[in-house]
Each structure stands twice: as C-alpha cells, then as structure tokens.
Amino acid sequence: MAVTACQGLGFVVSLIGIAGIIAATCMDQWSTQDLYNNPVTAVFNYQGLWRSCVRESSGFTECRGYFTLLGLPAMLQAVRALMIVGIVLGAIGLLVSIFALKCIRIGSMEDSAKANMTLTSGIMFIVSGLCAIAGVSVFANMLVTNFWMSTANMYTGMGGMVQTVQTRYTFGAALFVGWVAGGLTLIGGVMMCIACRGLAPEETNYKAVSYHASGHSVAYKPGGFKASTGFGSNTKNKKIYDGGARTEDEVQSYPSKHDYV
C-alpha cells in the first residue's frame, strides 16, 4: 500500500513539475526590465527564450520573435536546449510511468517489469528536473552578469556618455516557475526510485519442512544442508547446492512443532 502511494505521489508530483517546466519554457517573462534608475518609462520590456515583448505606456503590448539563430548568444541556445531536453525526457518518463503504476493492470505484466519501468521513469524525471534547474540557473547567471556590466557601463563610456546597453534586466517570473518545477520533477523522480525498491519482487522464504517414511534413519541438517537418510553420499554435511540461486532448502530453518522428521 505504501509503495503504491509513494509511486502514485511521485507520478503526480512529476506531472505537476513537467507541466511547470513546459509553462516556464513557453513564458515570456524570463527577464524583465529593471525600472530602477531608468529614465525611459514609456516602455516596459520583458523577454523570454523565444521572443521579446514591449508594453507601452498607452497599454499597447507587442511581441516579436528572435528570428535569427546566429545573432543570439550561445548561452541562450544552451538554455533552450536544456529546457527542451528536460521536457522530452519528462514526457517520456510520464509515458513510461503510466504503464508502471501499480494501480493500473496491463495484461499480465510482472511486478519485476513494473519495478524496472518505475526505476526508468524515476531516473528520467531526475534528469529532466536537473536539466530544467540547470537551464534556469544558466539564464539567471547570464542576467546577473549582464546586470552588473550594464551598471558599470552607466558610469563609463566616451565622455561619460553611455555607449552600450543602458537597459538592465532582472529575474522574471519564469525563472521561479522553472526552479520550482525542476525541483518538483526531481522530487517526483526520487519518489519513483524509492517506490521501485518496494515493487521489486522479493524471494519468498519458505520454512523447510521434510516428510520422510518412518522406516528410515533420518538426520535433520539445518542451515542449508540437505536432509539426508544417512545412507547417501552426503554424510559429511557437504552443501548440495552451489551458485547464486537459493532454494527453499538453503533458507535456514529451525525445528518447530510443525517439523516432523
């Protein structure tokens, strides 16, 4: 029951996280114009991974896509790639995890197969979450670097005149959405991996019970030794079974009132 709950919760948390990563990737507010000490108040600019938007004092808002690929910073391209990889991995993870859910029966799927699928989806969610967190963090670092460069340029330049970027940008809402979503996807992935351990079928332990005809002299050999009649070749208590496979005889058993020898 706890395993099913952990798996189900992991799935739901990851689902919310991936929805958040998709939302963040599509949002236009990755960076917003810093209004502090900016004399230009007629326009407010905010930018996403795909386009830039301007809201004018009249209330009119216009957005334009970044139609050039070569003119864009490599860091922006890297962030785009990380977010897309995160979404793709997350989507595949969701698909796999749906079939892995313990509460859903598909044909005669073994528990071991479900455990493997749960682990696979969990790892995918973890990588997806890490991609999103990395992407957002790279973008945030780019903004911080640009902010301080812009601040420095405000007080330098030819003849004290600003010669470079005067508009400074600060963190937009999409960054926080991305961080939270990436974290949720990561947590969901960890929960799936934990659930996988509980799903894996454990080897059944049977008490070794031997029934023999009363006419023979029977020796009870506990601790993984084959019960012997005393006439066989195993009179020196040698282990019958070698290798990794465990048999019911190999599971240590102690005599109880139900053991008849």
């Epitope: 960076s31 007629a42 600019n45 830039s52 957005c63 970044y66 600003v162 508009t167 940008y169």
Partner: nanobody, 118 residues
C-alpha cells in the same frame, strides 16, 4: 551593424528654433525606440525625448511643451523640433536607437553640438 547619422545642430539665439534629424541605417530589430539625449559639459546624460516603435512618446521634464519628437518608421529616421530655446539647452545632442532584442542593444550617434546664445 546599425549606423546613426545626425544633422541639424548649430548656433542659435535664445528663443529661436532648430530641427535635428537622425537617420539609422542597417538592420534594426522590430521592437525599439529612437530618441535624443543630451549632455552639457560637466553634467550627466539627460533624456530629451524618445519615440517608440509602437508610437509612444516620452519627453524629458526640462523640454516638455517646447520640443517635439517625430518619427518616420519607413525611413528609420527620428526628428527633434526644438523651439523656444534657452541658453541651458546648450549641449551635445546624441541620437540613440535602443532595440529590444535579447537583453537589448544600444546604438549611439557621434553627437551634434547645439549652442544657444543670449
């Protein structure tokens, strides 16, 4: 690369008028503003007026009611009509194009001197 060419500066008497123009050549990102800034000797840069690609206009407090900015999007040109000039309007006037592509870009002209005498 965007190039800005300013013209129209010069010497004028107080109360007189001047018209500055600035033509931008090259590829400019669709979202932008074009405008004028000025800097008097020993002073900081000051906003004179800007005109955005969407049609919004903003004036600096010291020139409101006296200066008029206009923009011709087809020619990528911005004009500044200066009237009722005062000696304190004496400064180097810089044309500026700011584009709102990724993290913004600023382009500046070389500046044109405007001197207002009494």
């Amino acid at each position: 690369q965007v190039q800005l060419v300013e013209s129209g500066g010069g010497l004028v008497q107080a109360g007189g008028s001047l018209r500055l123009s600035c033509a931008a050549s090259g590829s400019i990102f669709g979202l932008n503003f074009m405008g004028w800034w000025r800097q008097a000797p020993g002073s900081q840069r000051e906003l004179v007026a800007i005109a955005t690609s969407g049609g919004s206009i903003q004036y600096g407090d010291s020139v409101k009611g006296r200066f008029t900015i206009s923009r011709d999007n087809a020619k990528n040109t911005v004009y500044l009509q200066m009237a009722s000039l005062k000696p304190e309007d004496t400064a180097v006037y810089y044309c500026n194009v700011h584009t709102y592509d990724f993290l913004g870009r600023d382009y500046w002209g070389q500046g044109t001197q405007v001197t207002v005498s009494l």
